[in-house]
């Protein structure tokens, strides 16, 4: 099995979507919460996050392939207040698992534009076959 987290962003007109995606097997979802933090270098948790999403096992999804669950945080109009360092994280206290995505930044420029930097590939957690699956 394998659980991993990615961070991405998409732009729709003036809106900026910050997206945290957790890739997991169907049976691994239960007990996980995905959350997005801003300017929380050491204490990113659901309690201190901008938004959180509790994953549920979807009984309608068949098969044992990898599926994804997404948390989306939408900024309707980026302002200087949105400048800062962001991080996607996921946690299951039930299993003691913590995933921390790469830090990425929003920088609001003097010209009224903004840039998003630091988005990288998945940070993942591998499970060997003899450990079974999470439930």
């Amino acid at each position: 099995g394998c659980i991993n987290i990615t961070s991405s962003a998409s732009q729709e007109g003036t809106r900026l979507n910050l997206i945290c995606t957790v890739w997991h097997k169907k049976e691994e979802a239960e007990g996980f919460v995905v959350f997005l933090c801003k300017d929380r270098s050491g204490d990113c948790s659901p309690e201190t996050s901008l938004k959180q999403l509790r994953l549920k096992r979807d009984p309608g999804i068949d098969g044992v392939g990898e599926i994804s669950s997404q948390l989306m945080f939408t900024i309707s109009q980026v302002t200087p207040l949105h400048s800062g360092t962001y991080q996607c994280c996921a946690r299951s206290q039930k299993s003691g698992i913590r995933l921390q995505g790469h830090f990425f930044s929003i920088l609001f420029t003097e010209t009224g534009n903004y840039t998003v930097t630091g988005l990288k590939q998945r940070q993942h957690l591998e499970f060997s076959h003899n450990e079974g699956t999470l439930s």
Epitope: E47, Q93, K94, S95, I97, R98, L125, S128
Partner: antibody, heavy 112, light 106 residues
């Protein structure tokens, strides 16, 4: 098969340091985190601290100043060290994989 | 810190009875509530997590419900092996246990 086993001294002198080891099998400590809990005789349960799969730690604020949790992933062992023990620290100490699979517990008596 | 109050502290019941145990938080737990069963001299066993998710291998006669600060564990038809002490645990902010409900044979 997931298994956890606590080991350590059954008797500790007041003011001394308690050292406990949790040895796990059937899973990797880099994939799952370990909690330490304790239960005084005839009483309820108390969470002490967590070492996550990534090695980060969280502690119960009431115990934080005298508690350290660490691990040796190559030996599949997690360690609890708590200093300045008093008689009220007498308890059964449990390690658990997250919240789900628990060891049988190690009895610790603090007495002179 | 979140405090949990369990009631009753002692419950007498018979095999086949439907019983309900209560757990009340001092503040919102956001459904991050688990239930454990503990028998004398044994480690606690996880029954329910996230309010109503049944742990693998636990019989379906156990169920959980609730929201906000108020939560319940229901055993639909008591079996002889169910007589034990039950603890609730909040995992919304750290971990805090209730004092327990002892379920004894009437």
């Amino acid at each position: 098969q997931v298994q956890l086993k606590e080991s350590g001294p059954g008797l500790v002198q007041p003011s001394e340091t308690l050292s406990l080891t949790c040895t796990v099998s059937g899973f990797s400590l880099t994939n799952y985190g370990i909690n330490w809990f304790r239960q005084p005789p005839g009483k309820g349960l108390e969470w002490m601290g967590t070492i996550w799969n990534d090695g980060g730690t969280d502690y119960n604020s009431a115990l934080k100043s005298r508690l350290t949790i660490s691990r040796d992933t190559s030996k599949s062992q997690v360690f609890l060290k708590m200093n300045s023990l008093q008689t009220e620290d007498t308890a059964i100490y449990f390690c658990a994989r997250g919240m789900e699979a628990w060891g049988q517990g190690a009895s610790v008596t603090v007495s002179s | 810190d979140i405090q949990l109050t369990q009631s009753p502290s002692l419950l007498s019941a018979s095999v086949g009875d439907r019983v309900t145990l209560s757990c009340k938080g001092s503040q919102n737990i956001n459904n991050y509530l688990a239930w454990y069963q503990q028998k004398l001299g044994e480690a606690p066993k996880l029954l329910i997590y996230n309010t109503n998710s049944l742990q693998t291998g636990i019989p379906s006669r156990f169920s959980g419900s609730g929201s906000g600060t108020d939560y319940t564990l229901t055993i639909s038809s008591l079996q002889p092996e169910d007589f034990a002490t039950y603890f609730c645990l909040q995992h919304n902010s750290g971990y805090t246990f209730g004092a327990g409900t002892k379920l004894e044979i009437k």
